[in-house]
């Protein structure tokens, strides 16, 4: 008996061959031998099977001894053996039909879980192996769980049913909720204007909710809502926004926040969050701002940094065009008595400068 | 066990639309075929159509262009309306059930029927 | 459409009587063909189904034959309840069809 292994929802066909290439009669019957389709001199005629409806044979290969019957939208208890009647023989084909769905929303939050679940007709014993977009395979049987997930898990699952050494593969697009970045910082020197930017990772036809930034400075002892914002329809609108910083907010997606000016009592990490309509969680991303400062103050030259910087940064103080130079591993680099000329401020990551400030130190007579 | 209890106008004017209601009792109307069959007085038995819970119908092709059929699941209930009605439209209509078993196919459940005259 | 012709329209037997009757088919129908019988202000009921196979419940003296077009159906010994009209029907293919039905009184 030969297996066809189909997909709900999917079309199938169930080929019989003659072995006359010529137009002859023939029966489509299911397993309780009831009439699906056949031939009644030229016309197909249909039985009263609840298979009738969806079932069609291709009419035009009929003088070529082909019998096939076409199955269309299938449905898991369409799973059956079908027999077709020519020539005085029975041909069975055994139909196995598979669903293959997410059950929940196929548009999930980072760190949310996804279930994929197999539906199979009673008495079959499939295996499921899927790949994630990002090369990951999951292996399971009537479902498969991905307990946590990943940015790089958005896309297309390519799941593959096996039985009977048949295979049937589905599809399945997955969304993840994230923003492009876990976390992102941004250096900049004392007084500059400050761009802060959230780029989503996914795109939706519509996109509602509502959002917030918590801020904790470096200097301060507790968090603070800097700003609160409503989405809708990617239309972004300010709801409440702190005196002090007076952030401004584009209008548009990617959500943007402008500072106008970096200061030391600003410097710190805050946490986007953003709450998406009919979804439970919250999308984050953390954001970091170092601000730097460079003063000469009588005979002592300082460099500061302010904010959320890893021990392994360095701090320089150098002579332009001179190999006078200070480095050290902390917040804080000084020269004293510095030589006239113009200093820079720099702060790097194994060579990278990663921000830069001038001070000119002029003679003193 | 399952019952069927057909309702609708009994008197139905020329050329209207005759509409009835077929309601199913003690079982779930999904997964199964549900069909019209009337039977002028004294005479014989005319399958009229079928739907199921997919909304998938089949119609004689003698009423095709008069019958419309639709089905809803929520109230466990199909209908059938019967378009441009003649004196000829009048009978007893009845709601039936169709089963499929081994070799068998037909009308298992029947409702009481229902009569529709149609006139002036 | 497959046209069922059913013979004759009516009869009346005795009790205890045999009692036979016809149901041809425009078209082969293989043995696609059910056999019902219907009470005066009844619905109809199942007797026989693949032309010859007894439902369930049903009294033996029921009985169905034939194949392709031509089918007979059977009450061996004639009984009172027997009173009804008799229809063939057929289930080789869409639309489902009657025969014209077959009124049995008794003498």
């Known amino acids: 008996k030969k297996v066809v292994l189909g997909k709900k929802g999917d079309t199938v066909e169930l080929t019989c061959n003659a072995s006359q290439k010529k137009n002859t009669q023939f029966h489509w019957k299911n397993s309780n031998q009831i009439k699906i389709l056949g031939i009644q001199g030229l016309f197909l005629t249909k039985g009263p099977s609840k298979l009738s409806d969806r079932a069609d044979s291709r009419k035009s290969l009929w003088d070529q001894g082909c019998f096939s019957m076409i199955i269309k939208n299938l449905k898991i208890e369409d799973s059956d053996t079908y027999i077709c009647e020519v020539e005085n023989k029975k041909e069975e084909v055994e139909l196995l039909v598979f669903g293959l769905t997410a059950n929940s929303d196929t548009h999930l939050l980072e760190g949310q879980s996804l279930t994929l679940t197999l539906e199979s007709p009673p008495g079959s014993s499939p295996s499921v192996k899927c790949r994630s977009p990002g090369g990951k395979n999951i292996q399971g049987g009537r479902t498969i769980s991905v307990p946590q997930l990943e940015r790089q898990d958005s896309g297309t699952w390519t799941c593959t049913v096996s039985q009977d050494q048949k295979t049937v593969e589905f599809k399945i697009d997955i969304v993840v909720l994230a923003f492009q970045k876990a976390s992102s910082t941004v250096y900049k020197k004392e007084g500059e204007q400050v761009e802060f930017s959230f780029p989503l990772a996914f795109t939706l036809e519509k996109l509602t909710g509502s959002g917030e930034l918590w801020w904790q400075a470096e200097r301060a002892s507790s968090s603070k809502s800097w700003i609160t914002f409503d989405l809708k329809n990617k239309e972004v609108s300010v709801k409440r926004v702190t005196q002090d910083p007076k952030l401004q907010m584009g209008k548009k997606l990617p959500l943007h926040l402008t500072l106008p000016q970096a200061l030391p009592q600003y410097a710190g990490s805050g946490n986007l969050t953003l709450a998406l309509e009919a979804k439970t969680g919250k999308l984050h991303q953390e954001v970091n701002l170092v601000v730097m400062r460079a003063t000469q103050f009588q005979e002592n030259l300082t460099c500061e940094v302010w904010g959320p910087t890893s021990p392994k940064l360095t701090l320089s103080l150098k002579l332009e065009n001179k190999g006078a130079t200070v480095s050290k591993q902390a917040k804080a680099v000084w020269v004293l008595n510095p030589e006239a000329g113009m200093w820079q401020c720099l702060l790097s990551d194994s060579g990278q400068v990663l921000l830069e400030s001038n001070i000119k130190v002029v003679p003193t007579w | 066990q399952v019952q069927l209890q057909e309702s609708g106008p009994g008197l139905v004017k020329p050329s209207e639309t005759l509409s009835l209601t077929c309601t199913v009792s003690?079982?779930?109307?999904?997964?199964?075929?549900w069909s019209w069959i009337r039977q002028p007085a004294g005479k014989g038995l005319e399958w009229i159509g079928r739907?199921?819970?997919?909304?998938?119908?089949t119609y004689n092709p003698s009423l095709k262009s008069r019958v419309t059929m639709s089905v809803d699941t929520s109230k466990n209930q199909f209908s059938l309306k019967l378009s441009s009605v003649t004196a000829a439209d009048t009978a007893v209509y009845y709601c039936?059930?169709?089963?499929?078993?081994?070799?068998?196919?037909?009308?298992?459940?029947w409702g009481q029927g229902t009569t529709v005259t149609v006139s002036s | 459409d497959i046209q069922m012709t059913q013979s004759p329209s009516s009869l009346s037997a005795s009790v205890g009587d045999r009692v036979t009757i016809t149901c041809q088919a425009s078209?082969?129908?293989?043995?696609?063909l059910n056999w019902y019988q219907q009470k005066p202000g009844k619905a109809p009921k199942l007797l026989i189904y693949?032309?010859?196979i007894l439902e369930t419940g049903v009294p033996s003296r029921f009985s169905g034959s034939g194949s392709g077009t031509d089918f007979t159906f059977t009450i061996s010994s004639l009984q009172p309840e027997d009173i009804a009209t008799y229809y063939c029907?057929?289930?080789?293919?869409?639309?489902?069809?009657f025969g014209g039905g077959t009124k049995v009184e008794i003498k």
């Open positions: 039936a059930r169709e089963l499929e078993r081994y070799y068998y196919y037909g009308m298992d459940v």
């Open positions: 739907i199921n819970t997919s909304g998938s119908t």
């Open positions: 029907q057929q289930y080789d293919s869409l639309p489902l069809t």
């Open positions: 693949y032309a010859s």
């Open positions: 078209q082969d129908i293989s043995n696609y």
């Open positions: 003690g079982g779930s109307i999904s997964t199964y075929y």
